[in-house]
Interface confidence: low
């Protein structure tokens, strides 16, 4: 048992030394636009980016370049700093993220933030088949055509669980939602892509209305739909929403496991040093016990 | 990205001159500094000058101070480094490199675009 006492007692040093080493850098800061990750060719956008307060300088890198600084002043008052693109064009368009310094220490890098620049070039034209108004369990497809020189089209549908279908083809590309539901009714809008940040105009909205019985509808809502003007603002709430939860689940989780870690090291040492301790309190009781024994057998001897 | 092309390099006897170009093309607005390297047969690539293509401000090596000087063009979007008095020991070959500057000054290594680099032989 004592034996094992120093290797069990290297473990947990080690351990707990990688945890501390774990330590050595910051929690990944959050990314984010505002108004939306999809900008309009000039207009302007601001890169959030929050970290801790106490923060001495915040480092926007672009396509893996340092791209902007900021030192935030007082630091101690401030965890957020916004970087502002007065004019947004196909140059700034790209993968950003961010990293924030305390004292000496470095964060982890942000997520990444895609950041696109729309209204480039044409206007793709979106229609679907069979039509716009459709049972449900019909199939339907929607087509998005566009005439200059574009491979990359994107299907997004306006609501709170929007999601970009990209599709492929030499001037249109066909999006198969396959037979649909009640959850598939709303607004649609389709892209064109010349590379992955470069998006044309959006195309005019097709409203998608699926009609099915009672129970249907019941089980499957409707997304909530906007008008076109706030064609920029659902998915940001979307965008922003998800990955704050998500790099706020990263943090969590990953402090949650180093301090359960912690804990079990610490767990584990104790109940093996209590182990020995109570180990050698008995092999200290035997050998009382045998002296004794042997001390009263002497006794005995001698008397006889 | 970036593209940078050096030209201008060749042979020259030892007092002699020779102008370096640099012509850079792609997203250049993302090109705050530009430099001149050079790396010898044998030897670690040397920094020679810097300039902040903003206001222009320019930075020497010691070993070229004074005999080299470091300028831009940009409506031609091109660097130029003017070499006077070369010696044999400058024969080496001659790199252009740009990035962004990294806390108000260029970065001491590590850049992210570089040219493919033009040959400078000095002879005596």
């Known amino acids: 048992m004592s034996s094992t006492l120093p290797a069990l007692l290297c473990v947990g040093l080690c351990l707990s030394q990688r945890i501390s080493a774990q330590q050595q850098t910051l929690p990944k800061p959050f990314i984010w636009a505002e108004p939306h990750f999809m900008v309009p060719k000039e207009k302007q956008v601001t890169i959030c980016c929050q970290g801790n307060y106490g923060a001495v300088e915040y480092q926007l890198h672009f396509e893996g370049s340092l791209f902007a600084v900021d030192r935030p002043k007082p630091p101690e008052r401030i965890n957020k700093v916004q970087f502002y693109i007065p004019d947004m064009n196909s140059r700034m368009a790209g993968q950003y993220s961010c990293i924030y310094r305390v004292g000496e220490l470095w964060s982890e890098p942000s997520n990444l933030l895609d950041l696109v620049v729309t209204e480039m070039y044409d206007t793709p034209t979106l229609s679907v088949h069979p039509g716009p108004e459709v049972i449900s369990g019909e199939k339907v497809t929607f087509y998005c055509r566009l005439d200059t020189a574009t491979s990359m089209f994107l299907l997004l549908k306006e609501g709170r669980s929007s999601h970009v279908q990209r599709g492929y083809g030499k001037v249109q590309a066909e999006f198969p939602l396959g037979p649909v539901t009640t959850a598939h009714r709303g607004t649609y809008r389709c892209f064109g892509s010349y590379n992955n940040h470069a998006w044309s105009f959006p195309s005019e909205p097709v409203k998608l209305l699926v009609t099915g019985d009672i129970e249907n509808t019941s089980l499957a809502p409707e997304d909530p739909t906007f008008p076109a003007d706030t064609w920029g603002t659902y998915l940001l709430t979307t965008e922003t929403g998800l990955q704050k939860d998500h790099a706020l689940w990263d943090h969590t989780a990953q402090n949650l496991l180093r301090m359960g870690l912690a804990f079990l090291v610490l767990v584990a040492l104790v109940w093996f040093l209590v182990e020995d301790w109570l180990s050698r309190k008995r092999t200290r009781e035997r050998a009382s016990r045998a002296s004794t024994w042997e001390g009263r057998r002497r006794l005995n001897t001698q008397t006889l | 990205e970036v593209q940078l092309v050096e030209s201008g390099g060749g042979s020259v006897q030892a007092g002699g001159s020779l102008r370096l170009s640099c012509a850079a093309s792609?997203?250049?607005?993302?090109?705050?500094?530009m430099g001149w390297f050079r790396q010898a047969p044998g030897k670690e690539r040397e920094g020679l000058a810097t300039?902040?293509?903003?206001?222009?401000?320019?930075a020497y090596a010691d070993s070229v101070k004074g005999r080299f000087t470091i300028s831009q063009d940009n409506a031609k979007n091109t660097l130029y480094l003017d070499m006077n008095t070369l010696k044999p020991e400058d024969t080496a070959m001659y790199y252009c490199?740009?990035?962004?500057?990294?806390?108000?000054?260029?970065?001491?290594?590590?850049?992210?675009?570089w040219g493919q680099g033009t040959l400078v032989t000095v002879s005596s």
């Open positions: 490199a740009a990035d962004l500057q990294y806390g108000g000054s260029c970065p001491s290594g590590g850049w992210k675009y």
């Open positions: 792609g997203y250049t607005y993302r090109t705050d500094c």
């Open positions: 300039i902040y293509t903003s206001d222009g401000r320019t």
